[in-house]
Interface confidence: low
């Protein structure tokens, strides 16, 4: 807001008064104001803003005041050459008050010549009858931005869904730089992935690491000189490996004697990715098995030829256990009965053209 | 059981460019972190830098400028070329692999092979 | 960078004694710490990682604990062939750092 006094009594502890009446410029200044007709004191339509030097491009200071008889700058408490000024004025159709504007331009090698702790600055000082008021400080900055960031973001390598901080400090500057977060050479919007968070103090926050997060970091600082970039921090999210679940024993890879059966599992669940660990353990369980061997059936030798029976045939047989088979093994091929004709015995054969029936003895 | 092999000149003149290859056996060189880490007589361990598989590196800053980490995932191989050495770069270099986890700890080891700057 | 510095840089001790070798990061790394044995003229030997988890095939005499900034490597009863250097080396950020190592001899 405006601050008003009246007659040079001071707001400011900016030693005021400080241009001293040899000064030729404040010899234009009134020495006495008219009471008569009475009139409010100056009041600032606009106000001079601070002000930044770009390279060697000089600023304007610019303010308006209403009523004014004069307007003047001051700068570091030193009144500004009545020349230096660039004033226009008008009365106001409506209140019928004086509207003065004044504008004055400041180079760089004006702010660079000042000498002291305190930054250059300027301010209004407004006359009406009433008395003075004088503007808010301006304040009138030669910007610059470092080339060096003063924290650097690192890379880093992170498993999923992780919370990733990197930091950057950016460069020292005038005015400060305002701070950007690249993925790679696109801006990061945290408004519209809600991932990412940018901190006060310009660090970057991926709050649940996701595979698509592996990507060059950059931070952008940037003021009205320039814009600088950090070095690119590589962030790896990576997946370290599971296993999946076992599959069903094998068949016992012996058909006959002492084997093993297998079972095996892969590291795909997930497999590791982007330099996650490998799983730990076994891929294969092996584990003794043993299988009966099969045996096939052999025939035992002939019996003897039974007697000769009634029916004029006598027989013989084998067994299939020698051995019998076991353990799946082949059955024995072949009869185990066989008979034939036979004539002698109890053998009962018909006479020829005859009833009877002779009977051989053996 | 993952074995790492450096080899290259034992003697580099200064300001030469120092060249070592590590040759990787026993297991694939994708999805781990591969180091260079050296040790001058008597001292302790530097990182050096490492490469990924997908060919992210990293470098110390400290020798970042003079410093190339380069892989052939072809040939199981990863190398390291160190450009203007001076006396101060007279060490045994180790390859080394970075386990992927967080902490990336360096499980697997070369036996490392000493390398003297001298004329 | 982040300087990981060991203490003490070396100690004496007799069979079954029990060891402990602390490690401070200059910042906060977590838990993103491992440990390493080197006997004289062969590589680093991965001991534990994770600053806590014990490598397969390491013996269980050997344990790691902490978590930020302080970290301690504990030997519960010193073996022979537990004469070495040991070496802590953090993964929180690049570059990688090891600490200066601790150089356990025989009393």
């Known amino acids: 807001g405006s601050h008003h006094h009246h007659h040079h009594g001071s707001d400011y502890k900016d030693d005021d008064d400080k241009g001293s009446q040899d000064d030729e410029f404040f010899h234009e200044l009134p020495e006495t104001f008219p009471s008569d007709p009475p009139e409010p004191l100056p009041h600032f339509l606009i106000e001079p803003e601070e002000a930044y030097i770009v390279k060697n491009k000089p600023v304007n200071l610019y303010c308006k005041a209403s009523p004014a008889t004069q307007i003047y700058f001051k700068c570091n408490s030193e009144w500004v050459h009545q020349k230096d000024h660039v004033v226009d004025e008008r009365v106001d159709e409506t209140s019928g008050l004086i509207v003065r504007e004044v504008s004055i331009e400041i180079s760089r090698q004006q702010v660079e010549e000042l000498f002291g702790p305190e930054d250059y600055w300027c301010q209004c000082v407004a006359w009406s009858s009433a008395g003075t008021t004088k503007s808010r400080k301006a304040y009138v900055r030669i910007a610059y931005l470092r080339k060096t960031f003063e924290q650097e973001p690192l890379g880093k390598e992170v498993s999923l869904e992780q919370e990733v901080l990197l930091q950057c400090r950016p460069p020292e500057g005038i005015p400060v730089a305002e701070v950007e977060w690249l993925k790679n050479e696109d801006i990061i919007d945290p408004a519209e992935d809600r991932n990412f968070y940018i901190t006060i103090d310009h660090n970057l926050i991926i709050k649940q690491a996701r595979l698509s997060d592996t990507a060059n970091y950059t931070c952008v600082a940037k003021n009205i000189v320039a814009k600088r970039k950090s070095t690119t921090a590589t962030v790896i999210v990576y997946v370290n490996g599971g296993w999946s679940t076992w599959t069903e024993w094998s068949v016992c890879n012996s058909r006959c004697g002492r084997g093993y059966q297998k079972r095996t599992r892969t590291c795909t669940n997930p497999a590791p990715l982007n330099g996650g660990a490998f799983c730990e353990g076994q891929s294969v369980q092996k584990i003794a098995c043993t299988t009966l061997c099969p045996v096939d059936g052999r025939w035992t030798s002939w019996s003897k030829w039974s007697t000769c029976g009634t029916e004029c045939t006598h027989w013989r047989r084998r067994e299939c256990t020698a051995p019998a088979p076991k353990n799946g093994g082949k059955d024995c091929d072949g009869l185990v009965l066989q008979s034939k004709n036979c004539t002698d015995g109890l053998c009962m054969q018909a006479a020829p053209d005859s009833d009877d029936v002779a009977l051989y003895g053996s | 059981q993952v074995q790492l092999q450096e080899s290259g000149p034992g003697l580099v003149k200064p300001s030469e460019t120092l060249s070592l290859t590590c040759t990787v056996s026993g297991g694939s060189i994708s999805s781990y972190f591969w180091s260079w880490i050296r040790q001058p007589p008597g001292k302790g361990l530097e990182w050096i830098g490492y490469?990924?598989?997908?060919?992210?590196?990293n470098y110390n800053p400290s020798l970042k400028s003079r410093v190339t980490i380069s892989i052939d995932t072809s040939k199981n191989q990863f190398s390291l070329k160190l450009s203007s050495v001076t006396a101060a770069d007279t060490a045994v270099y180790y390859c080394a692999r970075g386990r992927g986890m967080a902490t990336l700890p360096f499980d697997y080891w070369g036996q490392g092979t000493l390398v003297t700057v001298s004329s | 960078d982040i300087q990981m510095t060991q203490s003490p840089s070396s100690l004496s001790a007799s069979v079954g004694d029990r060891v402990t070798i602390t490690c401070r990061a200059s910042?906060?790394?977590?838990?993103?710490l491992n440990w390493y044995q080197q006997k004289p003229g062969k590589a680093p030997k991965l001991l534990i990682y994770a600053a806590s988890s014990l490598q397969s095939g390491v013996p269980s005499r050997f344990s790691g604990s902490g978590s930020g900034t302080d970290f301690t490597l504990t030997i519960s009863s010193l073996q022979p062939e537990d004469f070495a250097t040991y070496y802590c080396?953090?993964?929180?950020?690049?570059?990688?750092?090891f600490g200066g190592g601790t150089k356990v001899e025989i009393k």
């Open positions: 080396q953090q993964s929180y950020s690049t570059p990688l750092t």
């Open positions: 490469i990924h598989n997908s060919g992210t590196t």
């Open positions: 910042q906060s790394i977590s838990s993103y």
